[in-house]
Each structure stands twice: as structure tokens, then as C-alpha cells.
Interface confidence: low
Amino acid sequence: PHLRTFTDRFQTCKVQGAWPLIDNNYLNVQVTNTPVLPGSAATATSKLTIIFKNFQECVDQKVYQAEMDELPAAFVDGSKNGGDKHGANSLKITEKVSGQHVEIRAKYIGTTIVVRQVGRYLTFAVRVPEEVVNAVEDWDSQGLYLCLRGCPLNQQIDFQAFHTNTEGTGARRLAAASPAPTAPETFPYETAVAKCKEKLPVEDLYYQACVFDLLTTGDVNFTLAAYYALEDVKMLHSNKDKLHLYERTRDLPGR
Amino acid sequence: SPCKILKCNSEFWSATSGSHAPASDDTPEFCAALRSYALCTRRTARTCRGDLAYHSAVHGIEDLMSQHNCSKDGPTSQPRLHTLPPAGDSQERSDSPEICHCEKSFHKHSATPNYTHCGLFGD
């Protein structure tokens, strides 16, 4: 999947299986990524687990779990708030669009999480205070938490280079260095560009991610995934000057 | 004790369902659990110096990683939901959010916090 980290780095990761996105004293988020096509290096998120840890007099430990075709509007215990404590309503799940869009607000830690199902796969977005992000036992050990440090270098796909190589080449398909098997021939480059331009008129990294995803999979739902990801940034990002990210030298992951 | 090694140990215990020597087809899951365990021990390292269980864990992880040919990089295991311990009152640290009323939006010393964003989408 495409990852925008807490430090606004933008990466395309091919990590498969269960990986931690966030882990601190208050919140644990893990995703499971699966290949989008058989034999593909490109992966998308098929499962998401969010654990809100027990916090003082506010909330009991609550677990939210979403999977492909199952985006519940409740925690796994069936509740929609933080439990029986007097501050239980400081943690709330709201269903925005049934089966497609859920928002979780944890006021006690100033955190908002948006989970969506777009097509077959899930998207995740979070707004969280830096102080909560930094509330970890040992900063140095946070090497594999994707939101904090990004993907390991060997798990990244250089989709920007791919975009540059394919731009303006008509129906050029994914070549030998491709991260995935060739997508259906019905998606030439121009069509992918046109479809992405409809939803993402600004040619930023979200637009480029959209083009990459269409060429990789032939699945138009990925256009919506990129569109909603940008919409979630608009809602959640505190710096309105950083809504759009543009192509630049690829960052190395934090170490 | 601020040393959270018991938390790491019990999470690992749960993740491996008590299986000390998993069958070969379980090895990827076992390795993922070991990596989670290793991460957990590193997170609590500074507060565990001299702790018997902590050092036993560190050495045990190295042994098990080697026995099962686990690579140090790779996926970690999904948390076992029923065993993740609470961050409850007794474990609150000095850098914890100081919330007077749960219903009020997050604050610390009345300052507006610096927010940050992370997102994951597409392929």
C-alpha cells in the first residue's frame, strides 16, 4: 500500500502479512497486507486491528477490527464507546457510510481515526497529537512501526520512477522491473491518467499513486482509494500547506 | 516496576499458544511472534537493566531465532486481543497526557497539541 508517515514522507510499500503501523502507550494499530494479484509484489490492506488501551478513569481496553467486506461500526465486544467508565464517551465509533466509512474519535488522547473500505481493500488515516506518538517506552526501538519510521528500504517500491518511465508512452505496460503482473490490457496509460485526473486534478503523489495502482491492477476502485485518502488528509492534517505532496527524491526510512 | 518484560513475555506466550517448538509449517508465524517479542523487549530495555526475566528473554529470543532460522526483519505477529495488558493507572508515566476530564479534547497544560497524520491506502 501507499504510506504517508507522521513526517509526511510518502512511500509505496510491498510489505506482506501483519505489520505494526502505530504502537505507543495508548494505541496499537496493525495492518495485514496481501498481494493485489497472484505473484504481485504490490500489496493492499486486507485487515486492520486497532487497540485502544485501558486509560485511567476514561476508557476500558477496546479493540476494533476490520477486514475485507467487513467494516463494523462497533468494537469487537459490540460496544460503540469506551465501556463502563465515567469517561466512556470520550471514545466513540461513528458509522459515516454503512459498510464503507467509519470514524473513531478518542477525545481523551486527542485522536481521530478514519477507516474505509474502498473496493475490496481497506484504507486508514489518523490524526494524533505528537505527544501521544512519542509516548513510547524506548524511542530507539520503534524501527518497524510504519507510521513513525516508514517501510524498510527493501520493502519499498519506487513508484515515482515507474511513473516517470511510463509517462507519455501511450499504451506502454509494466515492464520487467514491474512490481506486479501486467494488469488487464484494457487499461492503457492514457486511460489510467484520465480516470485519475477526474478525481485528482492536482498532479501530486496521490495522483501518481492512483495511476500506479490502475496500471498495476486494472481496478478502478483504487482511483477512489487515492481520492478518499486525500480527502482524509484534508480533514485530518493540521498543516493545510502540506495537503499535497509532490515528487521529490525518495526518502530513506528512518533508522 | 517500570520494566514491562512480563508484558512482553505474556504476549509472546499467547501469540505462540504455549508452543515451545512449533511444527515446521508454523515457523513463519512463530518467527513473526519472536520479532514482536524482540521489539517489545527493546522497547522496555532501558527500564529493565539487571532484571532476571528481561535478560533471560533477550537470550531466549536469540536462541529461538537461530533455532527456527528466523530473519531479524519481517512481519510481526498480530496482537492477541485478549492478552494485551492495559496501560492502566499504575503504569502512567510522566509523559502521559494529563487529562482532567475525559470528555474534554486532549490538552496538556492548556496548550494546543501539535497534531500529526499518518495514512495508508491503495496498493
Epitope: - | 520494566c3 512480563l6 513475555n9 509472546f12 506466550w13 533471560s56 537470550h59
Partner: antibody, heavy 120, light 109 residues
Framework: EVQLVQSGAEVKKPGASVKVSCKAS????????ISWVRQAPGQGLDWMGW????????NYAQKLQGRVTMTTDTSTSTAYMELSSLRSEDTAVYYC?????????????WGQGTLVTVSS | QSALTQPRSVSGSPGQSVTISCTGT?????????VSWYQQHPGKAPKLMLY???KRPSGVPDRFSGSKSGNTASLTISGLQAEDEADYYC?????????FGGGTKVTVL
């Protein structure tokens, strides 16, 4: 075969020090901690402390802090326990024991014991 | 006085079952998975019989079993045999200390 072999019996005067050795064989010495446990005549087991041969880190029972020193020599796979300012109540059999690793916390292999007698 | 309390002695006839209790606090026993049991014959070194409350090392007969309820851990010997006559000690890791019970003498009648 995993084994811990301890040094022989000692007789010491009050105020003196004693150093007991424990030689490990049959396993990777640095992969397990070594605990020391003592047992006064006719009494129960009393945990004294632990050392990591890997890092040299130690963890001593509170009541012995300042009097006990545990060390290891990884080149010979030997652990040592030194107890200073001996008193008559330190008369006991002293055992070294291997600590199981990771979450498997237990003392799974024991030395044969070393009798230390403190008498004037 | 030990922080873990065991009965001084228990006895049973061959073939019977005996249970030894080990009572501590919530931190030493109740919340701990680190309860182990050791058998000691006179003049010998202790031998590990159970660890992590219920687990048996290889070589320990399955007539030895462990359990825990609240702040009390228990060792049960079912089908008592003559060679089971010995002292038994419970042990718990608590915080940074390892605690032993006072020991229980098991007598086979």
C-alpha cells in the same frame, strides 16, 4: 548432557569472604542466566541473585545487596558467587542453577551444591 | 518468614492424590505466570518439576500437575509413589525478586 559442577566445601571464619565457582557444560553458557540459591541446614531454599553471562548484568536479592558479588568467565563457562562479611547464619549449602530463557522462567539445571561453613 | 506460604507437611498413601498449596500476593502469584515447583530429596539438589504454573519439563511424570486460582498456586501429585517422598518448594518471580515458599514435606504412608 547439560551440567553445572560446583567447587568443593569451604570453612570460613566470621568476617571473611568465600567465592564459590560453578562450571557449566553441555549448552551455550551465554544463552542462560545463572541463579544462586542457598539452603541453611534444615531450612528452605533462599534465592540470592542472578547474573547474565551474556551481559554481566546482575540482580541481587535485596537483603544481600552490598555483600554478594556474582561474576562470570565466559572463556571457561564458569560462574562465581562471592559473599563477604560472613556471619554464622551464612552457613548453608550454596547452589548455582541455570535459568530457563525467555518466557520459560524456571531453574532447570542445578549444581550439586557447595557447603560453606562459617565458624569461629 | 517466606513471602509464599506452604503447608509444612502433607501425606498420603501410595496411589492416592495429594495437593500442596502455595499462597502469595497478587503480584507474587495471582498475576504471575512464573510459578515453578521443585522437588528435593534429602542431601540432593532441587529438581524442577513444573514451571509457568502448569508446564512439565520432559522427564517429569504426568502424575505431577499444577494449577492456580487467585493468589494460590497448587501442585498435585496423583497416584502417589514411594519415590515422591521429598520436600517440595514453590517459587515465583515477582518484580525483580525470586521468592521461594517455605517448603512442604510430602510423606508417603
Amino acid at each position: 548432557e547439560v551440567q553445572l559442577v560446583q567447587s568443593g566445601a569451604e570453612v570460613k571464619k566470621p568476617g571473611a569472604s568465600v567465592k564459590v565457582s560453578c562450571k557449566a557444560s553441555g549448552y551455550t553458557f551465554t544463552s542462560h542466566g545463572i541463579s544462586w540459591v542457598r539452603q541453611a541446614p534444615g531450612q528452605g531454599l533462599d534465592w540470592m541473585g542472578w547474573i547474565s553471562p551474556y551481559s554481566g548484568n546482575t540482580n541481587y536479592a535485596q537483603k544481600l545487596q552490598g555483600r554478594v558479588t556474582m561474576t562470570t568467565d565466559t572463556s571457561t563457562s564458569t560462574a562465581y558467587m562471592e559473599l563477604s562479611s560472613l556471619r554464622s547464619e551464612d552457613t548453608a549449602v550454596y547452589y548455582c542453577a541455570r535459568v530457563g530463557s525467555g518466557p520459560y522462567y524456571y531453574m532447570d539445571v542445578w549444581g550439586q551444591g557447595t557447603l560453606v561453613t562459617v565458624s569461629s | 518468614q517466606s513471602a509464599l506460604t506452604q503447608p509444612r507437611s502433607v501425606s498420603g498413601s501410595p496411589g492416592q492424590s495429594v495437593t500442596i498449596s502455595c499462597t502469595g500476593t497478587s503480584s507474587s502469584v495471582g498475576d504471575s505466570i512464573y510459578v515453578s515447583w521443585y522437588q528435593q530429596h534429602p542431601g540432593k539438589a532441587p529438581k524442577l518439576m513444573l514451571y509457568d504454573v502448569t508446564k512439565r519439563p520432559s522427564g517429569v511424570p504426568d502424575r505431577f500437575s499444577g494449577s492456580k486460582s487467585g493468589n494460590t498456586a497448587s501442585l498435585t501429585i496423583s497416584g502417589l509413589q514411594a519415590e515422591d517422598e521429598a520436600d517440595y518448594y514453590c517459587c515465583s518471580y515477582a518484580g525483580t525478586d525470586t521468592l521461594f515458599g517455605g517448603g512442604t514435606k510430602v510423606t508417603v504412608l
